[in-house]
Amino acid sequence: AVNGTSQFTCFYNSRANISCVWSQDGALQDTSCQVHAWPDRRRWNQTCELLPVSQASWACNLILGAPDSQKLTTVDIVTLRVLCREGVRWRVMAIQDFKPFENLRLMAPISLQVVHVETHRCNISWEISQASHYFERHLEFEARTLSPGHTWEEAPLLTLKQKQEWICLETLTPDTQYEFQVRVKPLQGEFTTWSPWSQPLAFRTKPAALGKDT
């Protein structure tokens, strides 16, 4: 949602967290601002304190409950407001009617581990974190491998168009250090975006056996 020179963007992690970023052109005085969440069909409401992440943007996480609790559904609409203190009052700086399952960004995949490694291949698995059971198998993944002398940005993206929590990396160089990352995205939601990349998993391929190709 955009109000004048202000931008207010929020994502739902599909379980019990709404993360918001509010940016505003022109520095505000030292004032306290927060995000208020008012669901249309729930008895609870929630607030988080916006904290600066750069000169003109602030962020906060609305914790709606226990990490794996299903706090919202596809029919919920949550009114999200940015409120800033002026005098003794709060001023509405930005507002949006937020449809959680149209604005999804899952948590980064976790528990990355090497299942099996060879000279030219490596099998890696991972788990998804705090993802709603509503998705069933309707998830996709992107993975990337960091080779020596390259940057993450240069790494080609490998796309997994189904809920597959493992990958077999091929055509690797023997006895070489690599790093691997993966991210996840539900197929649902007009404004849904990729999760952050997972923590990188470092692994090393096996050295080639002398006089023998494995």
Partner: antibody, heavy 121, light 112 residues
Framework: EVQLVQSGAEVKKPGASVKVSCKAS????????ISWVRQATGQGLEWMGE????????YYNEMFKGRVTMTRDTSISTAYMELSSLRSEDTAVYYC??????????????WGQGTTVTVSS | DVVMTQSPLSLPVTLGQPASISCRSS???????????LEWFQQRPGQSPRLLIY???NRFSGVPDRFSGSGSGTDFTLKISRVEAEDVGVYYC?????????FGGGTKVEIK
């Protein structure tokens, strides 16, 4: 029905203090702000500041800082405005007015009937 | 502080005729949230002020539709389409965009 009932007229000597009360009814006192506005005889309106009864937080117009004190007693849904070091220019009608804690639409919707304060030696 | 200047100071009108009051602010009163907190109050003789219009053009509940507000930036207008006897009094504009909030000096509407 929302009502703000203010205390009666006061006559004070220069240098003295005056304390005006504003009793609220018809709504939850701690959910709204109470603003104070004054109107000198034949003059316009001047916003003095406000108090949020929910936590007692106050904000004063710079013009009155150091001379004005706003307080509240939630047990009797009453807000108070005290003005000290009175001078003849403080002769005015003092109004309390209700305002939304979240300023989304308007500053003040319901007003008290006003309290006349006369400063004279 | 934002200075609000109203004109005219006095406005004699004929019953049933339109009336227009101008309010000019010394600086732009668009708040950083892109809203303009310009309000109009009516003060009938011997009474407290009463909210008529908020956010430039929105009528407060119970306000007759003969009252309308318009304007933007620094120039605002309150119009009464057909003046009635009960409209006599002083009208004040008010800005709530920049603290300290300030009122205009008032315009006295009287019947000719």
């Amino acid at each position: 029905e929302v009502q703000l009932v203010q205390s009666g007229a006061e006559v004070k000597k220069p240098g003295a203090s005056v304390k005006v009360s504003c009793k609220a009814s018809g709504y939850t006192f701690t959910d709204y702000v109470i603003s104070w506005v004054r109107q000198a005889t034949g003059q316009g309106l001047e916003w003095m500041g406000e108090i949020y009864p929910g936590d007692g937080n106050t904000y004063y117009n710079e013009m009155f800082k150091g001379r004005v004190t706003m307080t509240r007693d939630t047990s009797i849904s009453t807000a108070y405005m005290e003005l000290s070091s009175l001078r003849s220019e403080d002769t005015a009608v003092y109004y309390c007015a209700r305002g939304s804690y979240t300023y989304d639409n308007y500053a003040m919707d319901f007003w008290g009937q006003g309290t006349t304060v006369t400063v004279s030696s | 502080d934002v200075v609000m200047t109203q004109s005219p100071l006095s406005l004699p009108v004929t019953l049933g005729q339109p009336a227009s009051i101008s309010c000019r602010s010394s600086q732009n009163i668009v708040h950083s949230n892109a809203q303009t907190y310009l309000e109009w109050f009516q003060q009938r003789p011997g009474q407290s002020p009463r909210l008529l219009i908020y956010k430039v053009s929105n009528r407060f509940s119970g306000v007759p539709d003969r009252f309308s507000g318009s304007g933007s930036g620094t120039d605002f207008t309150l119009k009464i389409s057909r003046v009635e006897a009960e409209d006599v009094g002083v009208y004040y504009c008010f800005q709530g965009s920049h603290i300290p909030w300030t009122f205009g000096g008032g315009t006295k509407v009287e019947i000719k």
